[in-house]
């Protein structure tokens, strides 16, 4: 190899050992029979050399640095060449460095030809291995503007007082152009300006200078976004830290087209604007930091550009002004993310404060709009607390658990509407009475309606799930001892059509000791499947639950248990089942941990089934499934 550098080129070449590898044989640079591991070539020098091994790219790297002095003479502006040409260089990993020094009053602009640049953060790398590292200067301090790959949106970076640009090319890369040019501009009066150009839908992730370390104290950095007129942009902060300010306040400022309040100033912790049409600027302003405990300011954010939907021009009013203790959240459905670009899906408050999820609280009217390619990507969850503090006032008081019609006007699907029903401990209990009798969801007879009621304890320490219930069954009411949550969960968009079938009434009733009581009136046409609460996890320790099963006068009920034995093993206590005829009060008691369950049996009159659990050994829980069928009486047995 021969490398010759012209005397006035201001280029130095350095060949040195790269990161050490575990290769057995060492490799050397050979210059007139002398072996060395480092070679420096200065302007005006011409050197012939070879390598002592077959694959020097595994051992050495080459750095080509060109110093451009714009302080003492005119600047060589225009397209930057790779000098010496890559064809003259040995095939090593190579880094071209351009170090441009300029006056503070001079602005320097790096312009990147298509496919432009994409900034990447710590721990990431470029697919093709081609990397741009760009730094600026504040007095004598070097500031990292960022590291970039190809295929992005960054088209220009403006700085002042000097630029250091490093282009890293892997040894196998055929590239022979720098891909950028330098131009001079007037002073930008800030650390830097990064221009990001979107041609169509897409996203860009950008970072403050020195990221993930701290942004320089009291500095200003600006990003200019060029957005096609027919698209909308939304900003979301992925990660940020605030420093400890002594004077001034850290903030971001937006220049948004059409805004009457430019610049719009936001704190970093605020929701950032979305649904913006046209070009806009975003600036990060630092503060004077506390000398003793400065902390760090840093910001990583994303700009998402997408087509507006028809819905984004509509304003929806959600009136929660007459509601109490209610919150409505619109959020993304959980989905597997694909690797390709996915347009953002935002919900906007007052059209501008857009985010991926939004919670509205009771007591106000809210105006919302959507910026989303497909509104089925969102769903709605509502929580409402109904509590009783004074048992004398609440007793026998009833509330209707009904989804307000306002919610059906919104263009997103309702997922859950949860009512948290809270009662004074040991003073009152609750009864749920459905508008239509309920069916308990079981594997044997699953619910196939568009919605179900999920009933569970709302006591933090208690893991008790009564079950999932849907309209069209035999359960007339559910009584529960203490605090519960009732969640109406929808399973299909057809819920809007079936909404009339929903409706539960909750009443506060005198306190009782059992965890739950189900009142069941079987249908003559079908089997009623019933199962103990907490199915698959087992009825909680020492819990008692009952079923009050009505048998019509002209019918006989057959009670059948799914298994011969429960399989429960008691660590302490015994588990009992008591079947009691309501007319005669005659009862049969079964020790569930010791004895077999009864064979199918016939009841001519209404009866109770009560199950009281022990403290089961782990893995040997009490789960019981049984069913009731009615058949007409053939003989009058009264």
């Amino acid at each position: 190899f021969e490398i010759a550098l012209p005397r006035e080129s201001n280029i130095t070449v350095l060949i040195k050992l790269g990161t050490p590898t575990l290769l057995a044989k060492p490799c050397y640079i050979v210059i007139s029979k002398r072996h060395t591991t480092m070679l420096s070539i200065k302007p005006g020098e011409r050197i012939l050399f070879t390598f002592s091994c077959q694959s020097p790219e595994n051992h050495f790297v080459i750095e080509i640095q060109k110093n451009i002095d714009c302080m003492s003479g005119p600047c060589p502006f225009g397209e930057v060449q790779l000098q010496p040409s890559t064809s003259l260089l040995p095939t090593l990993n190579r880094t071209f460095i351009w170090d441009v020094k300029a006056h503070k009053s001079i602005g320097l602009e790096l312009q990147f030809s298509i496919p432009r640049l994409r900034q990447f953060g710590p721990g990431e790398s470029c697919p093709d291995g081609v990397t741009y590292s760009i730094s600026g200067r504040i007095d004598a301090t070097v500031v990292r503007i960022g590291t970039f790959c190809s295929n992005g949106t960054v088209s220009r970076i403006k700085m002042q007082e000097g630029v250091k640009m490093a282009l890293h090319l892997p040894w196998f890369h055929p590239r022979n152009v720098s891909g950028f040019s330098i131009a001079n501009r007037s002073s930008i009066k800030r650390l830097c300006i990064i221009e990001s150009v979107f041609e169509g839908e897409g996203s860009a992730t950008l970072m403050s200078a020195n990221y993930p370390e701290g942004f320089p104290e009291d500095e200003l950095m600006t990003w200019q976004f060029v957005i096609p007129a027919h698209l909308r942009a939304s900003v979301s902060f992925l990660n940020f830290n605030l420093s400890n300010c002594e004077r001034k306040e850290e903030r971001v400022e937006y220049y948004i087209p059409g805004s009457t309040t430019n610049p719009e100033v936001f704190k970093l912790e605020d929701k950032q604007p979305g649904n913006m049409a046209g070009n806009f600027n975003l600036s990060l302003q630092g503060c004077d930091q506390d000398a003793q405990n400065p902390g760090i300011l840093r910001l990583q954010f994303q700009v998402l550009v997408q087509h507006p939907q028809n819905e984004s021009n509509k304003i929806y009013v959600v009136d929660l002004s007459n509601e109490r203790a209610t919150s409505l959240t619109i959020e993304p459905r959980p989905v597997k993310q694909s690797r390709k670009f996915v347009p953002g899906c935002f919900v906007c408050l007052e059209s501008r404060t857009c985010s991926t999820n939004l919670t509205l609280t009771s007591g106000s009217k809210h105006k919302i709009s959507f910026l989303c390619d497909n509104l089925t990507r969102l769903w709605m969850n509502v929580e409402k607390n109904i509590s009783c503090t004074d048992h004398r006032y609440c007793q026998r008081k009833s509330y209707s658990l009904q989804v307000p019609s306002d919610i059906f006007h919104l263009p997103v699907e309702l997922h859950d509407f949860s009512w948290k029903l809270l009662v004074p401990k040991d003073r009152l209990s609750l009864v749920l009475v459905p508008a239509q009798k309920l069916q308990q969801h079981t594997h044997e007879k699953p619910c196939n309606t568009s919605f179900s009621y999920l009933v569970a304890s709302a006591i933090p320490s208690q893991d008790l799930y009564f079950g999932s219930f849907c309209p069209g069954g035999s359960i007339e009411q559910i009584q529960v001892k203490q605090n519960i949550s009732v969640t109406l969960r929808t399973f299909a968009p057809s819920f809007r059509q079936e909404a009339s079938r929903q409706g539960l009434t909750v009443s506060f009733i005198p306190y009782f000791k059992e965890e739950g009581v189900f009142t069941v009136t079987p249908d003559t046409k079908s089997k009623v499947y019933l199962r103990t609460p907490n199915w698959d996890r087992g009825l909680p320790s020492l819990t008692s639950v009952s079923w009050n099963i009505s048998v019509p006068r002209d019918q006989v009920a057959c009670l059948t248990f799914f298994k011969e034995r429960t399989g429960v093993v008691c660590q302490t206590g015994r588990a009992f089942m008591i079947i009691q005829e309501q007319r005669t009060r005659a009862e049969e008691i079964f020790s569930l941990d010791e004895d077999a369950l009864p064979k199918p049996r016939f009841h001519h009159h209404s009866f109770w089934v009560n199950i009281s659990n022990c403290s089961p050994a782990s893995g040997k829980q009490l789960d019981l499934l049984f069913w009731v069928t009615l058949t007409p009486r053939t003989v009058d047995l009264t």
């Epitope: 302490t572 206590g573 009992f576 010791e594």
Partner: antibody
């Protein structure tokens, strides 16, 4: 009123067998676990065996395991204790006792009604 | 097995006085302890279960307390018919075990 009446006691030679019966009335027999408890002359109470209400589980004291068998016939409201390989130390008054059902209930049995006892003497 | 130890073996008290019988378990039996009374020539009678719950028809002068390994049966005011033998029984673990008994006699 709960009544328990033991029968079948008597004198038997060591190595011999005896079958005690306990006839129950005044309660739904199949609902309740039952036990046998014995008392040697001038000594304290010693639990012997127990059986669950439907006969699905049986329990024995180590001193009688393998020699005594507890069983029940719920259709006849009767509890049994088959005693084989009898030893002199098995000499005692044998009481049959009914379990109390308390919900939630303890693992073992609490005896809330007792028979008057059947005397068993093992002697040559 | 769990060994139940009652103390004292015999307790002499005057009628009308207060008396306390003790029962100690060799390991914890939680509250799974019962007390029985046995009169001469009769079957035992259940007094207390669950360490402190009086059985049906048992007068209020009998009370039980304790949990774990230490239990007591207390008579608030002894009647003449109370001077008989008392047994404690644990039912926390198999086998069920009784104490050796305490005889209450008139002083």
């Amino acid at each position: 009123e709960v009544q328990l009446l033991e029968s079948g006691g008597g004198l038997v030679q060591p190595g011999g067998s005896l079958r005690l019966s306990c006839a129950a009335s005044g309660f739904t027999f199949s609902n309740y676990a039952m036990s046998w408890v014995r008392q040697a002359p001038g000594k304290g109470l010693e639990w012997v065996s127990a059986i669950s209400g439907r006969g699905g589980s049986t329990y024995y004291a180590d001193s009688v395991k393998g020699r005594f068998t507890i069983s029940r016939d719920n259709s006849k409201n009767t509890l049994y204790l088959q005693m084989n390989s009898l030893r002199a130390e098995d000499t005692a008054v044998y009481y049959c006792a009914k379990d109390i059902v308390v919900v939630p209930a303890a693992k073992g049995y609490v005896m809330d009604a007792w028979g008057q006892g059947a005397s068993v003497t093992v002697s040559s | 097995e769990i060994v139940m130890t009652q103390s004292p073996a015999t307790l002499s008290v005057s009628p009308g006085e207060r008396a306390t019988l003790s029962c100690r378990a060799s390991q914890s039996v939680s509250s799974n302890l019962a007390w029985y009374q046995q009169k001469p020539g009769q079957a035992p009678r259940l007094l207390i279960y669950g360490a402190s719950t009086r059985a049906t028809g048992i007068p209020a002068r009998f009370s039980g307390s304790g949990s774990g390994t230490e239990f007591t049966l207390t008579f608030s005011s002894l009647q003449s018919e109370d001077f008989v033998v008392y047994y404690c029984q644990q039912y926390n673990n198999w086998p069920l075990t009784f104490g050796q008994g305490t005889r209450l006699e008139i002083k």
